[in-house]
């Protein structure tokens, strides 16, 4: 009696159980009563990652440098290429199909948390007593210079974008 179901790593065709092709190989011809399933390895730029009966291998993913992508792991006949973002960029989606540059914090803002491969820079306004005069993805707000510790006085007040300017103390004439 012809089978109605087949074992694992087999498939049913023409009332017969044929072996599936192993990962990295595609189907050329189904088995017959007298011959085993015929499979062929995928070419260098292709892959199949499961036991299968596919007649075509899948093309490896292309990591497009125009989208900020680079190869993280080269594909094999059994695995797809894995792309990742270039340094200074992060993924725009879960599947990481494109990348965007890490945000820079503008003058008056400092970096609260640097970016990761999946999340952007977090910026914060510089509070009173701190400043940032650069646009940066790494720089935190810096404290104003303490003129007193240098035996100087504040000549120009600091802002969130500029440091204080220190100057010599006016010496009173006798």
């Amino acid at each position: 009696e012809p089978p109605t179901a087949c074992r694992e790593k087999q498939y049913l065709i023409n009332s017969q159980c044929c072996s599936l092709c192993q990962p990295g190989q595609k189907l050329v011809s189904d088995c017959t009563e007298f011959t085993e399933t015929e499979c062929l390895p995928c070419s260098e730029s292709e892959f199949l990652d499961t036991w299968n009966r596919e007649t075509r291998c899948h093309q490896h993913k292309y990591c497009d440098p125009n989208l900020g992508l680079q190869v993280q792991q080269k594909g094999t006949s059994e695995t797809d290429t894995i792309c990742t973002c270039e340094e200074g960029l992060h993924c725009t989606s879960e599947s990481c199909e494109s990348c965007v540059p890490h945000r820079s914090c503008l003058p008056g803002f400092g970096v609260k948390q640097i970016a990761t491969g999946v999340s952007d820079t977090i910026c914060e306004p510089c509070p009173v007593g701190f400043f940032s005069n650069v646009s940066s993805a790494f720089e935190k707000c810096r404290p104003w210079t303490s003129c007193e510790t240098k035996d100087l006085v504040v000549q120009q007040a600091g802002t969130n974008k500029t440091d204080v300017v220190c100057g010599p103390q006016d010496r009173q004439r006798a």
Partner: antibody, heavy 115, light 107 residues
Framework: QVQLVESGGGVVQPGRSLRLSCAAS????????MHWVRQAPGKGLEWVAV????????YYADSVKGRFTISRDNSKNTLYLQMNSLRAEDTAVYYC????????WGQGTLVTVSS | DIQLTQSPSFLSASVGDRVTITCRAS??????LAWYQQKPGKAPKLLIY???TLQSGVPSRFSGSGSGTEFTLTISSLQPEDFATYYC?????????FGGGTKVEIK
């Protein structure tokens, strides 16, 4: 001081639902992406879900996709995790954590799924 | 998914010892790696981020190094309060993943 406090854990039967909350204080909640991480008894850490600072992007671990929903209310400084179709393997302490580099963390809330 | 393999999984050491924990990633993750310390019944605490940057308030005896696929956490001189479990975590791609943990116990 900077603080995250989870609540809403408890004992629930398989197939039922539960909603966890995470109340933030001492920092600007609305600029941070927020995460849920869980830890089964005696086991390691497992990342569960993330939501972007404005709620526009959400990603989930495969083990909870389609069952759990992460959300936030920036006006209330609160993060949520709606857990549906709960399974025994969801039993864990659930932590919320803030920011790109998971700092700070809450103290955790225990969810036990058992019949 | 990116797998993180921590070694050793268990470590017995004495106060004052230099301790090194390794974390290997199954794919390159640049420097997007964090280290956490967890004590029993407590939440994890961030020690190191971006592979080598010490989190504010963390003692300087903790240091991190590495990039790509191989990373290390070093405690230069183990203190009584350092006996805990340590986890690495990659933040390069979703889903974010943690290593299996390294338990540091008193010899």
């Amino acid at each position: 001081q900077v603080q995250l406090v989870e609540s809403g854990g408890g004992v629930v039967q398989p197939g039922r639902s539960l909603r966890l909350s995470c109340a933030a204080s001492g920092f600007t909640f609305s600029i941070y992406g927020m995460h849920w991480v869980r830890q089964a008894p005696g086991k390691g850490l497992e990342w569960v879900a993330v939501i972007s600072y404005d709620g526009s992007n959400k990603y989930y671990a495969d083990s909870v996709k389609g069952r759990f929903t992460i959300s936030r209310d920036n006006s209330k400084n609160t993060l949520y995790l709606q857990m549906n179709s709960l399974r025994a393997e969801d039993t864990a302490v659930y932590y919320c954590a803030a920011g790109n580099w998971f700092d700070p963390w809450g103290q955790g809330t225990l969810v036990t799924v058992s019949s | 998914d990116i797998q993180l393999t921590q070694s050793p999984s268990f470590l017995s050491a004495s106060v004052g010892d230099r301790v090194t924990i390794t974390c290997r990633a199954s794919q390159g993750i640049s420097s997007y790696l964090a280290w956490y310390q967890q004590k029993p019944g407590k939440a994890p605490k961030l020690l190191i981020y971006a592979a080598s940057t010490l989190q504010s308030g963390v003692p300087s005896r903790f240091s991190g190094s590495g990039s790509g696929t191989e990373f290390t956490l070093t405690i230069s001189s183990l203190q009584p309060e350092d006996f805990a479990t340590y986890y690495c975590q990659q933040l390069n791609r979703y889903p974010l993943t943690f290593g299996g943990g390294t338990k540091v116990e008193i010899k």
